[in-house]
Interface confidence: low
C-alpha cells in the first residue's frame, strides 16, 4: 500500500506557512500588513490583556468541532466585552430579597457600541465567575421579558468547587433580539432549580461582584471578575465589505 | 486559475460507486453481501418496517454534521426497540394522581436482551408521541434515582401543535447506568417545569398511550405508538471483532 | 455553501458537491438490502484552485481564500464537509435487521 | 484518532497531523501581532492508501476502510478534521483590538 | 479639567438652518456618549439627543427628529448639531452636556449653552 | 406636561431642611434608570448635583443627599445656605418615550 512517492517536507512547510500568511491576511480583509506607526510603545492595556485571556481561555475550553463554516464565519470576529450594570444602580433595588436568584442587568446602548447592527453578532456569551462551594446545585437562567415576566434559557449543574470558575452561558440569540429592540436596561436572572415538589428553593452558589452575601460589594473591586456579555462580531466596516461581494463566487 | 486537466466524471463515478460498495460491507463487518437463503418470502415485518421508518425518520431531522467519528462509531449500528412496560402495571398505582408529571418504567432486563454489553450502546433515545395541544409548555424530564428520587436529565420548550408529533430525549448515559446495574424496573418522569413563584404547575401536555386523561387507555391499541426506547448499538459478534482488532493501525 | 442546493443548481467547475444516486440492484448487483432500493450518495469533485507563492499579488488572491482554500493547506482537497447517515434493512439468516451506517450521503463539500 | 496525542508520538508514515509551529516574527517576519508571538498551527500529511477495483479481493482490504477511505471518496486525501480558533491582538491606528479567527489550529486529521 | 465650549449660535430666520458645535477637552472624547439639551427662555430644561461613543447610535426628541441630526468626530474632539427647517419654538440655549459613565445619561458636564434665536 | 412632576416652587429659611421631590413611574423612575439631580444658578449651566439616586457628585457638598423609592425620587438640603437658591432639575432615562430622557418640570428654590 505504499504511495513510493517522497515527499519534500520542508516545502510543504513552506507552503503552508505561505498559506497561513495568506489566510490570516484574509480573515482580517487586509491587503497588506497594517501600518505599525501610530502603536502607543510599552505593554498592551491591561483591559486588552484580559479580554485576549478570556478569550484565549474560551477556545481551550472549547471542544475542537469542525463546523460547517458560514462564509460569514470565515472571517475575524472582534472580540469586546460589556460589563454589567453596577451593582449600586437603583435598578436592583426591588431584587434584593430574593432568596432563589440573582439579577444581571445590562444596558443595551453599550452593547450596540460594541455591535451596531444585529447581523454582525456571531456569538454572545454571559460570563460569571462562580466563588468556591462546597455544594452542588442545579441552576437555571432566564432572560427578563416583559415587566414581570422571565423567559427560560438554560440550566446547569454545578458540582462543588475548591476555586473560583467561570461559567460561560451562550445567549447569541437573546442579545440580538436586544439589539433589534430600542435602547434600555435588559437582564438575565440566574436561579435555583425549583422541582415541582422542592421546599428548599434557595440558590446556593454566590457569583463574583453580584452575591448579596458579600457586604460593600467587594467584588466590584476586581471589575474584571464581575459578570459581563462577551461579544464576538464582525467589525461593521469588514461587514460592508462582506455584503457587498456575497453573490459573487 | 484553471487546473486544466479534464476529468473523466464517468471514471470517478465508477471509482465512487466500488469504494461504496466496500464502505457498506466494512461497515457490517462483513467480507462478502450475506447470504440470501433462508430469507422468508413476503414483505418486511411491520414492527421492522415500522423500526426502519422511525430511525430513517430520525435522520431526516438532524442537521448534518460532520461529527469527528469514533473508531468504534464508523461500523454500522443495529437498531432496536424496546416499549414502555404497560399501563396496567402495579408500579403506576403510586403516580395516578400527580398532576405535575407522568411516568414511564422500563424493564432491564428487555433493555439487556437488546444490548448484552454496556459499552455495545451507541445512542439511547426515549421517544414519546405528543398529542395535538393547543397550549405552550415547559417540560422537564427525570430519572429515577433511588426510591424517591429523580434526577434532572433535560428539558425543552413544546409548542402548540395541531397533529401528533414524536418528542425525542437523548438517554444514552441514563440506559447505559442501567444496564451496568442489575435487572429491574427503572424509569422516568416527564414534568411540567415548574419555577420558583409559579403557582399553575400542572403538566398539560398528553402523551400517546400514557396520558390519565384517555380512559381504558386507548392508546395501546396503537402500541407502536406508546413511548418506547429506541436503541443503536454495535450487534456483540462485531464488537468482539472490533475489540480484537483496535490496537492494530 | 457548496452544498447540493448551490451545486445541483449550478455549473461550478470548482470543487462542489456532485449528484449520484446507488441503486443497490443495478449499480452493486445487490439483492440483499431489502430497504432502501438506493440512496443519493453523492460525491465530491472539482479543483481547489489556491495560488500560493511568496511573490503572489495578496490582494488579487486573498478573497479567493474563503472558497479555495480556508484551511491555508499546502495543498487543498475537495472533500465532503456534512455527511448523513443511512438506514438500511437485510436479513441475516431468516432473522430482519435494521441497521444505521455513519457518514453514507454527502450533503456539501469544502476545500481542506 | 488521528490527533496530536497519537501523531506526535508515532512515526506514521500515512495521513496523520503534523507539528508546525509558526512564529510570527521569523516565519512570517510580522511584527505587527502582537499577542500571541506564534501558535501550532500543524498540518495533515500523508498517503490515505485505499486500493480500490472491481476485482480486489474485499476481505482483504475491507478492514483498511475505517482508516484510510471512511469516506468512500473515489480519491481519498488527507484533511484537516477538528479545528480550533486563534485569538490575536493588533492594532489599527493607535488602537488595539482582539480578534479571533476561526478553524486556525489543526487538531487531528482523517483521510476524506 | 474637563471642558465644552458651544458655539455657532446666533440669529436665523423660520426655515433657516444652523449648526452648533462643541469643542471638548480634559477627557477622552471617544469614550463617551454626548447629548444636547435646551432651555427656551423662562422654561425648564429638555432633552434634545444624543450620540453615543463611537457615533453609532443617535436619539433625538420628537420636536426635532427629522430636523436635527447629531453627529461628532472624534478626531477632533468635536461635537456637531446641524439644525435644518428652524421654528420659533426651537429658540433656546443650547447645551452641551456629557455622560458621567459612557451611556449612562447622567451629565457631569456641561457647556456654558450658546443661543439660538429663530425669528422673522 | 413633564413626565417627571416637581414642585414649581419652594421656599426655605437658611438652616432648615427642605426636600425636593420627583414623581415618575415604573417607565422612568421605578424601572431603576439612572435618576440624577441638577442644579442650576442664575445664569449659569446646569450642574449635577446626584447621579444614580443617591450618589453625591465630585465637589458636592455633603448637604446635599438623594434617596428613591418605587416612582418618587427625593432631594434633600440640610442646612439651607443663601447660594442655595436656585433651580433644582431631576432628570431620567424613560423607556417609553422615543425621546428617551426626560427632565423634570424644575423646582426653584427660594432662600427667605
Known amino acids: 500500500l505504499s504511495t513510493c512517492k517522497t515527499i519534500d517536507m520542508e516545502l510543504v512547510k513552506r507552503k503552508r506557512i505561505e498559506a497561513i500568511r495568506g489566510q490570516i491576511l484574509s480573515k482580517l480583509r487586509l491587503a497588506s500588513p497594517p501600518s505599525q506607526g501610530e502603536v502607543p510603545p510599552g505593554p498592551l492595556p491591561e483591559a486588552v490583556l484580559a479580554l485576549y485571556n478570556s478569550t484565549r481561555d474560551r477556545v481551550a475550553g472549547e471542544s475542537a468541532d469542525p463546523e460547517p463554516e458560514p462564509e460569514a464565519d470565515y472571517y475575524a470576529k472582534e472580540v469586546t466585552r460589556v460589563l454589567m450594570v453596577d451593582r449600586n444602580n437603583a435598578i436592583y433595588e426591588k431584587t434584593k430579597d430574593i432568596s432563589h436568584s440573582i439579577y444581571m442587568f445590562f444596558n443595551t446602548s453599550d452593547i450596540r457600541e460594541a455591535v451596531p447592527e444585529p447581523p454582525l453578532l456571531s456569538r454572545a456569551e454571559l460570563r460569571l465567575q462562580r466563588l468556591k462551594s462546597s455544594v452542588e446545585q442545579h441552576v437555571e437562567l432566564y432572560q427578563k421579558y416583559s415587566n414581570n415576566s422571565w423567559r427560560y434559557l438554560g440550566n446547569r449543574l454545578l458540582t462543588p468547587t475548591d476555586t473560583p470558575e467561570w461559567l460561560s452561558f451562550d445567549v447569541t440569540g437573546v442579545v440580538r433580539q436586544w439589539l433589534n429592540q430600542g435602547d434600555g436596561i435588559q437582564g438575565f436572572r440566574f436561579s435555583a432549580h425549583c422541582s415541582c415538589d422542592s421546599k428548599d428553593n434557595k440558590l446556593h452558589v454566590e457569583i463574583n461582584g453580584i452575591s448579596p452575601k458579600r457586604r460593600g460589594d467587594l467584588g466590584t473591586i476586581h471589575d474584571m471578575n464581575r459578570p459581563f456579555l462577551l461579544l464576538m462580531a464582525t467589525p461593521l466596516e469588514r461587514a460592508q465589505h462582506l455584503h457587498s461581494s456575497r453573490h459573487r463566487r | 486559475l484553471s487546473t486544466c486537466k479534464t476529468i473523466d466524471m464517468e471514471l470517478v463515478k465508477r471509482k465512487r460507486i466500488e469504494a461504496i460498495r466496500g464502505q457498506i460491507l466494512s461497515k457490517l463487518r462483513l467480507a462478502s453481501p450475506p447470504s440470501q437463503g433462508e430469507v422468508p418470502p413476503g414483505p418486511l415485518p411491520e414492527a421492522v418496517l415500522a423500526l426502519y421508518n422511525s430511525t430513517r425518520d430520525r435522520v431526516a431531522g438532524e442537521s448534518a454534521d460532520p461529527e469527528p467519528e469514533p473508531e468504534a462509531d464508523y461500523y454500522a449500528k443495529e437498531v432496536t426497540r424496546v416499549l414502555m412496560v404497560d399501563r396496567n402495571n402495579a408500579i403506576y398505582e403510586k403516580t395516578k394522581d400527580i398532576s405535575h408529571s407522568i411516568y414511564m418504567f422500563f424493564n432491564t432486563s428487555d433493555i439487556r436482551e437488546a444490548v448484552p454489553e454496556p459499552p455495545l450502546l451507541s445512542r439511547a433515545e426515549l421517544r414519546l408521541q405528543r398529542l395535538k395541544s393547543s397550549v405552550e409548555q415547559h417540560v422537564e424530564l427525570y430519572q429515577k434515582y433511588s426510591n424517591n428520587s429523580w434526577r434532572y436529565l433535560g428539558n425543552r420548550l413544546l409548542t402548540p401543535t395541531d397533529t401528533p408529533e414524536w418528542l425525542s430525549f437523548d438517554v444514552t448515559g441514563v440506559v447505559r447506568q442501567w444496564l451496568n446495574q442489575g435487572d429491574g424496573i427503572q424509569g422516568f418522569r416527564f414534568s411540567a417545569h415548574c419555577s420558583c413563584d409559579s403557582k399553575d404547575n400542572k403538566l398539560h401536555v398528553e402523551i400517546n398511550g400514557i396520558s390519565p386523561k384517555r380512559r381504558g387507555d386507548l392508546g395501546t391499541i396503537h402500541d407502536m405508538n406508546r413511548p418506547f426506547l429506541l436503541l443503536m448499538a454495535t450487534p456483540l459478534e462485531r464488537a468482539q471483532h472490533l475489540h480484537s482488532s483496535r490496537h492494530r493501525r | 455553501a457548496l452544498d447540493t442546493n448551490y451545486c445541483f443548481s449550478s455549473t461550478e467547475k470548482n470543487c462542489c458537491v456532485r449528484q449520484l444516486y446507488i441503486d443497490f440492484r443495478k449499480d452493486l448487483g445487490w439483492k440483499w438490502i431489502h430497504e432502501p432500493k438506493g440512496y443519493h450518495a453523492n460525491f465530491c469533485l472539482g479543483p481547489c484552485p489556491y495560488i500560493w507563492s511568496l511573490d503572489t499579488q495578496y490582494s488579487k488572491v486573498l478573497a479567493l481564500y474563503n472558497q479555495h482554500n480556508p484551511g491555508a493547506s499546502a495543498s487543498p482537497c475537495c472533500v465532503p464537509q456534512a455527511l448523513e447517515p443511512l438506514p438500511i434493512v437485510y436479513y441475516v439468516g431468516r432473522k430482519p435487521k435494521v441497521e444505521q451506517l455513519s457518514n453514507m450521503i454527502v450533503r456539501s463539500c469544502k476545500c481542506s | 484518532a488521528l490527533d496530536t496525542n497519537y501523531c506526535f508520538s508515532s512515526t506514521e508514515k500515512n495521513c496523520c497531523v503534523r507539528q508546525l509551529y509558526i512564529d510570527f516574527r521569523k516565519d512570517l517576519g510580522w511584527k505587527w501581532i502582537h499577542e500571541p508571538k506564534g501558535y501550532h498551527a500543524n498540518f495533515c500529511l500523508g498517503p490515505c492508501p485505499y486500493i480500490w477495483s472491481l476485482d480486489t479481493q474485499y476481505s482483504k482490504v475491507l478492514a483498511l476502510y475505517n482508516q484510510h477511505n471512511p469516506g468512500a471518496s473515489a480519491s481519498p486525501c488527507c484533511v484537516p478534521q477538528a479545528l480550533e480558533p486563534l485569538p490575536i491582538v493588533y492594532y489599527v491606528g493607535r488602537k488595539p483590538k482582539v480578534e479571533q479567527l476561526s478553524n486556525m489550529i489543526v487538531r487531528s486529521c482523517k483521510c476524506s | 479639567e474637563v471642558q465644552l465650549v458651544e458655539s455657532g449660535g446666533g440669529l436665523v430666520q423660520p426655515g433657516g438652518s444652523l449648526r452648533l458645535s462643541c469643542a471638548a477637552s480634559?477627557?477622552?472624547?471617544?469614550?463617551?456618549?454626548v447629548h444636547w439639551v435646551r432651555q427656551a427662555p423662562g422654561k425648564g430644561l429638555e432633552w434634545v439627543s444624543h450620540?453615543?461613543?463611537?457615533?453609532?447610535?443617535?436619539y433625538y426628541a420628537d420636536a426635532v427628529k427629522g430636523r436635527f441630526t447629531m453627529s461628532r468626530d472624534n478626531g477632533k474632539n468635536t461635537l456637531y448639531l446641524q439644525m435644518n427647517g428652524l421654528k420659533s419654538e426651537d429658540t433656546a440655549v443650547y447645551y452641551c452636556?456629557?455622560?458621567?459613565?459612557?451611556?449612562?445619561?447622567?451629565?457631569?458636564?456641561w457647556g456654558q449653552g450658546t443661543q439660538v434665536t429663530v425669528s422673522s | 406636561l413633564p413626565v417627571l412632576t416637581q414642585l414649581s416652587s419652594m421656599s426655605g429659611s437658611p438652616g432648615q431642611t427642605v426636600t425636593i421631590t420627583c414623581t415618575g413611574s415604573s417607565s422612568n423612575i421605578g424601572g431603576g434608570y439612572y435618576l440624577s439631580w441638577y442644579q442650576q444658578l442664575p445664569g449659569t449651566a446646569p450642574k449635577l448635583l446626584i447621579y444614580?439616586?443617591?450618589n453625591r457628585a465630585s465637589g458636592v457638598p455633603n448637604r446635599f443627599s438623594g434617596s428613591k423609592s418605587g416612582n418618587l425620587a427625593s432631594l434633600t438640603i440640610t442646612g439651607l445656605q443663601a447660594e442655595d437658591e436656585a433651580d433644582y432639575y431631576c432628570g431620567c432615562y424613560d423607556s417609553s418615550l422615543s425621546t428617551g430622557y426626560v427632565f423634570g418640570g424644575g423646582t426653584k428654590l427660594t432662600v427667605l
Open positions: 444614580n439616586a443617591n
Open positions: 452636556a456629557k455622560d458621567r459613565i459612557r451611556s449612562s445619561y447622567e451629565y457631569d458636564s
Open positions: 450620540i453615543s461613543a463611537a457615533g453609532i447610535s443617535r
Open positions: 480634559g477627557f477622552t472624547f471617544s469614550n463617551y456618549g
